[in-house]
Each structure stands twice: as structure tokens, then as C-alpha cells.
Interface confidence: low
Amino acid sequence: QLTTESMPFNVAEGKEVLLLVHNLPQQLFGYSWYKGERVDGNRQIVGYAIGTQQATPGPANSGRETIYPNASLLIQNVTQNDTGFYTLQVIKSDLVNEEATGQFHVYPELPKPSISSNNSNPVEDKDAVAFTCEPETQDTTYLWWINNQSLPVSPRLQLSNGNRTLTLLSVTRNDTGPYECEIQNPVSANRSDPVTLNVTYGPDTPTISPSDTYYRPGANLSLSCYAASNPPAQYSWLINGTFQQSTQELFIPNITVNNSGSYTCHANNSVTGCNRTTVKTIIVTELSPVVAKPQIKASKTTVTGDKDSVNLTCSTNDTGISIRWFFKNQSLPSSERMKLSQGNTTLSINPVKREDAGTYWCEVFNPISKNQSDPIMLNVNYNALPQENGLSPG
């Protein structure tokens, strides 16, 4: 059976296509090519007579066609108008005509696309941005890339207009890009230059550093404030509610206890119109901001009830601290038999009773800090009662 094949099937505009013929019958008078799916004299491109080996152009001939003795048709410098069906009619020597139809598709060599945007300076969590890939061309696939990756699945990303438009709903600061669009057809592809978004956001809640709260008199107080913001935030400082200066950093040399108070950093973004503040308490004191863990010791940890006494000692190297004692989560002393001495460092129990058995610990504290010792266990034994009836245990 007579067939035709387009080489290639998808042709780039300006290139050439060869309509190949397969299974051409042996005994022929001639053949003709027509534009379209049927034989139409008005749309004949060329006729070829085998006997004279002469080609005759038809009404649809554009001067770009060449017919070969094997009936193949070459079309050069193709345009998109050449897209479609082509029909070959073979006039055999038995005067029976045979026909075959083939087709090809002409695609343009795509230009470098560009991205247009309805808003290149959106505000975070407020604005949507629509990117459009230009130009609009027929038979073109539009692809989008964010950070050189294909589009992630996200409810905030919407494609429309045949994928030519990419909409970002409610932009975030992480949506800066870069964004690229790519246009493809079967014969060519091209990618745009990257486009980035300048997302306006913030300020976020400021952070004051360092995180220290306690300072010694005579030290330098240097505080820095930072809030994520685009454009960068403008900063100001207040101490105990009173404006000090409009800087990102606050420096006070040789501080005294009078510099204790509330330090407020105020961050402002003039574009978003948003403000955020953070308050930090600064305490200037001679006291140690961290009290070390005290050690607890017992004169003995196993005693005989109603007979023995015991001394528990709480040791610490810190100065300016107070000590308190606890037994089973209760504050001591809790009975007349318990006495505190040596600035509460020693707890004496005399005599020890059954109810005194259990866990003891001490806590050292000053006005700004406290710390507890590990617990210590006091065991209280009683001498065994004599056996009844003089029976020995057995």
C-alpha cells in the first residue's frame, strides 16, 4: 500500500521537510502532489510525467517545492501556513489511481521569553503577584521554574491562561525567587532571564542581644536590636518608657544600679507601616546572678529512733545568700525536736523519731536566684521487740 512519511513530522519554521513515499508502484505514468486531504486541481502543487521526466508546477506551487523521481517532495524554508495535509496521487500504467495522504506541523523557532509582573514590590501576607510569560504564541507549552526547580505543589501557586500566568497568592518573604518561564514547542525551547521579587515584610518582633539580664556595676552595657524586615527596620530605644536614641545599638558605659530598668527596642518599617517592640529587663547588682548548687551532708544517714540525734549540714561557697530546709516538700523546722543553727546551715534533729525518716534537701537563695541540693535519705530504725513465748525465730 502506498504511504507517505514526513521527515521530520515536526518542522521548525524556516527549515525543510521531506515528504517521503513508500511502496511506490512500479508501472507508472506519472504522479501529482496536492495541498490538502484530497485531490483538487486548484490545489495542485506539482505534477511529474515519468516518460518525459518533466515536472509541471501547479496553482499551489510556491517555488519552494522540489519533486524527485521517487515521488518524494521536498519543501524548503517552511512557514506555519505550510502546516497540514498533503496528498499524493499516482497514475499507474493500468490507469488505476492510487492516493496517499501525509501531514507535518510547522512550529516557530521560539524567541527568548520575558516575564511581566503586576507587582514587583509586594507586601508579605497581603499582596498577590501575577507573572505572565510573554509573548503569547500558539501551540506553545509554558513552564515555570522557581529557584531553578519546577513548580512545587502549593495552594498559593496558581497557573492560569494556559499556564502562561503564574499567580502567587499572599506572598511571603521566601517567595523572592528567582522566577523563570520557559516556552516550548516540538522544535524549540527557550527560557527567560530570571526575575526576582522584592517582598516587603516586617518588622518581625525584635530580638535584643545579648540575652544577659544581670550586670555588675561598672560594666559597659551594650545592647543590639534586630528585627527581620524589608526594607530594613528603623530602630529606637526607650529606657523605662523614656525615648533615648534612634539607633540599632545602645551603649551605656560604666553602669550603676540606677541603670536597672526596662529597655525597650522599637522597630519600624516605613513601607509596611508596621511597628514591633521588645522589652528587656536589665538588673545591675553586686549579687551573683547564678547561685551554685549547695552540698548536703548528714552526720549519719541511718539512726535509731528515740535514741539517736542527727545533724544535716548545707554547704555553699556563695556569699550573701540565705538557706532554707525541706522535708517531704514541707518547710522546716516542723517540730520542737528540730533546730537550725549557724545561719541555717545546720539542721539538728534530737531525738530522731520514726516520722523523721525520709528525704531532706536544702535550698540556697538570694533576691535574684536560688538553687537546691540533691536530696539525702534519712533512715530510722527501731530495736526489735522481744519474741513472744520465748520462741526463737525460725
Epitope: 521530520p8 515536526n10 521548525a12 520557559e182 516540538p186 522544535v187 525551547a189 527557550n190 527560557r191
Partner: antibody
Framework: EVQLLESGGGLVQPGGSLRLSCAAS????????MSWVRQAPGKGLEWVSV????????YYADSVKGRLTISRDNSKNTLYLQMNSLRAEDTAVYYC??????????????WGQGTLVTVSS | QSVLTQPPSASGTPGQRVTISCSGS????????VSWYQQLPGTAPKLLIY???KRLSGVPDRFSGSKSGTSASLAISGLRSEDEADYYC???????????FGGGTKLTVLG
Amino acid sequence: EVQLLESGGGLVQPGGSLRLSCAASGFNFSNYAMSWVRQAPGKGLEWVSVISHGGGSIYYADSVKGRLTISRDNSKNTLYLQMNSLRAEDTAVYYCARDPTKGYAPTFDYWGQGTLVTVSS
Amino acid sequence: QSVLTQPPSASGTPGQRVTISCSGSSSNIGNNYVSWYQQLPGTAPKLLIYADSKRLSGVPDRFSGSKSGTSASLAISGLRSEDEADYYCGAWDGRLNGYVFGGGTKLTVLG
């Protein structure tokens, strides 16, 4: 996981022919331009040829034009290099490499392990 | 003779910063993107930098690329012993209609 596996290398006499294959897996082969790059023993890298993702565009290094032919079968996820009229200077490890940019910013992000072609009598 | 010119060798001690240069012309580096590849002994090349300065995912930020005019460079900071390898630059050449590589730079980490 992206994988490129070359095969078909071996010892061949000068003037002889060889056909290299590169089996691709772990990605959509028909979406990527593919290249062959070679490295002679103890020498640097030399690009050999590239074929576009659809096979419509092909380029060769001047040193191999007319002797080496690149092709691809997207249905088989395979890249080929037909090597004819081989010379001693074609002796090298031949790598196939993937271009993730479709040729807009040519680069090779994945390479095969290479196959050695030795041309010697 | 390679179309792109690289120094044959470079060296540095651990922790140091080293830079490898790559010189070309307007038909390659001047008008096309540059890539950098690392080839460890006995292995296939590995892409580090593409499009002049973009780091491939998974490549440490100690590696950075830059380009100016018809020259490009690869910088490696905080040098490590495992960075000892051959480094190649590459770019498309519009005049040759082909991809071109530099001759390669052998990086030695001393000490």
C-alpha cells in the same frame, strides 16, 4: 536516583568501529539534552558531542566530525555514540553526561561512570 | 591546547582559601555561562558550580564561583584534605558551536 550507565567500550584496531550506549534511569530522559565527554589517560576532559532532548539539534567537536555520530532513542531511554574510522587519539574513557538546562546554560549535572575505548593495533 | 586556560596546579594548607582561575574569550566565557567540575582520582567528574556562580544542591558553601568579562574563577575556602582533586572549568563556545573545557587544575592540600 539518576543513573547513567555506559557500555560498549573495549579494544579496537585503528580504522575500526565501535558503538557506545548510555542507559539512563531515574529521570525523564526525553526532557534532557545529552552529551558525550571523553578523557584520554592522564589528560583533561574533552567534549565530544551533544544532542538536544528531541534529537533535532546535534553538534560535534571538530576533532570527531564525520567519524562519530550521536543519536538517541527516547523510547528506550538510551543515548548512543557510533564511532567509525577510529584513531589512536580516540583512546579515552567516554562519559555520557546530562544537561539539565536543555542547552540554555549548558552544564553537566550527572555523569556516568565511563567506558574505556582503546584504539590500538 | 585547551580553549579555556587554567593553571596546571594549585595548592594550599588546610583551612586556607585557594582560587583557581579560568581564562577564555568573548565567544565562550564572555557570552556564555561557566561551570566548574571536581574530579576526584579514579572517579567521574562532579558538577560544583553552574551558571557562573550557582552552587549545585549539596555542594558545600565553601565552594564559590564568579565571573568577570572573559575570565572566571573558583574559590575554595576552609580548605580540606578531601578537596584534593582535579578541577575543570567549562562553557559553551558560540563560535565553535561546542562545549569547551579548561585543561584542568590539580589542587594539592599540603600538610
